[in-house]
């Protein structure tokens, strides 16, 4: 569940989680 930065009614900012994958897995070893 990614959220986007914005302003809510109580003037708190929403942190943008959009820079990170929602269900990350470990990088494959090559």
């Amino acid at each position: 569940s990614e959220t986007t930065t914005g302003t809510s009614s109580n003037s708190s900012q929403s942190t943008s989680n959009s820079g990170l994958a929602p269900n990350p897995t470990n990088a494959t070893t090559k």
Epitope: S1, T3, T5, S8, S11, S12, Q13, S14, T15, S16, N17, S18, G19, L20, A21, P22, P24, T25, N26, A27, T28, K30
Partner: antibody, heavy 115, light 112 residues
Amino acid sequence: EVQFVESGGGLVQPGGSLKLSCAASGVTFSEAWMDWVRQASGKGLEWVAEIRDKPNSYVTYYAESVKGRFTISRDDSKSTAYLQMNSLKTEDTAVYYCTGAMDYWGQGTLVTVSS
Amino acid sequence: DIVMTQTPLSLSVTIGQPASISCKSSQSLLYSNGKTYLNWLLQKPGQSPKRLIYQVSKLDPGIPDRFSGSGSETDFTLKISRVEAEDVGIYYCMQGSSLPWTFGGGTKVEIK
């Protein structure tokens, strides 16, 4: 204004423990995925740990270098994230930043591990 | 782990001139949802890092539009169309597609 304020850093001997805190304000903390990132003096950035939000079951992730020694946690009622650091090593010496999923960042707290 | 390689290591730019930083990842950053989790951050001298761009090209709120990001898969670029004095610092690319999250080594931008 969004603020993340870290505290709890200091000087500790190898093998010792510290608990870092990150108090958030001006942000909907309960929605934030919280990370700790560290930076040794004059070096680059290294990700340490992450804890996600309630809809994501507060799942946690750790860097291999701290797995089994560090524990990330959060208290949404206090808008605070924590990093419990045990069995500290000299190579853990760094400024530790808390960040909301790499979006907002705190000013950092210095952890020095030395005998 | 995904290795993030930035070039150049440092960059000396005249105010008003453009600047470009390259970031290459050792594996594709394209995630299964079709999004690419490549971020750019700036750490100004004596300050904590600040994110400029996420998902390759999306500017964070309050970031001037002289900054732009592009690229796909493993090759990414940050461009500053006209460098200003306040742009000095160390720029980092960072991938958020696969654990562990990893950062590039940084590119130091200074003014000539």
